[in-house]
């Protein structure tokens, strides 16, 4: 659900954190229409997720803690 590197919508399924290697934040006030978390998977896919949803917040927290502890 992305176009020109902007997410236009969100995935409707929960991704498991074991498949995710990182994320980037998309901000609506920086040239895109919606706020989003873009998860980067081991298979080199980019998945747009809703930053307000609980599962997304947990994964962002998990990945951020991993980076901090590196």
């Amino acid at each position: 659900a992305s176009n020109f590197d902007c997410c236009l919508g969100y995935t409707d399924r929960i991704l498991h954190p074991k498949f995710i290697v990182g994320f980037t934040r998309q901000l609506a006030n920086e040239g895109c229409d919606i706020n989003a978390i873009i998860f980067h998977t081991k298979k080199k896919l980019s998945v747009c997720a809703n930053p307000k949803q609980t599962w997304v917040k947990y994964i962002v927290r998990l990945l951020s803690k991993k980076v901090k502890n590196m």
Epitope: K52, Q53, W55, K57, R61
Partner: antibody, heavy 120, light 111 residues
Framework: EVQLVQSGAEVRKPASSVKVSCKTS????????FNWVRQAPGQGLEWMGS????????DYGQNFQGRLTITADESTTTAYMELSDLTPMDTAIYYC?????????????WGQGTLVTVSS | QSVLTQPPSASGTPGQRVTISCSGG????????VNWYQQVPGTAPKLLIY???QRPAGVPDRFSGSKSGTSASLAISGLQSEDEADYYC????????????FGGGTKVTVL
Amino acid sequence: EVQLVQSGAEVRKPASSVKVSCKTSGGSFNDYSFNWVRQAPGQGLEWMGSIIPVFDMADYGQNFQGRLTITADESTTTAYMELSDLTPMDTAIYYCARVAMVGATHFDIWGQGTLVTVSS
Amino acid sequence: QSVLTQPPSASGTPGQRVTISCSGGSSNIGSNPVNWYQQVPGTAPKLLIYLSDQRPAGVPDRFSGSKSGTSASLAISGLQSEDEADYYCSTWDDSLNDPVVFGGGTKVTVL
């Protein structure tokens, strides 16, 4: 009606441990995160930690690292909270509360609470 | 010491309007919706407001919530005796500290 039913009151000696259960009835177990919140007598609410069954992952509050273990049993749709090295300061009511994984981060349903008394 | 700051008490007479404030920071209220819980003495907390201004089914419309910047507020209009309870604000925190934070609670007394 969806409910979270917790185990009964416990009395423990200092330095021992306690395990409290939270059985969910209704709703898909893996669609939720199960959180533990405690309330000391006359005090406010304190988040302790959570378990995310679909991720098989637990997250612990800073004040409880090292002595808190939260687990879940999908077959019985039950979450557990075990707290070790108890002191009288751990005397409190312990609540479980659920959060929808696909949704915002609010506790929509709470258990009835379990009173844990730590006394010598 | 709670991450979110609430006044310890508030009061009003039946029919009055009472407002409770909840102050936080950029990593919590500033970037996440606020939830409010009501705890009647001797019972478990109950969800009162979620997503800053949404009421779950069954919550009377005399309860309303709002959020601006790093602060939120809960208003009770037409105060009733059964509203006497403790009220807690809560939200997610994007810092790497505890992800769920609460205010210290506000005891509402109906005079």
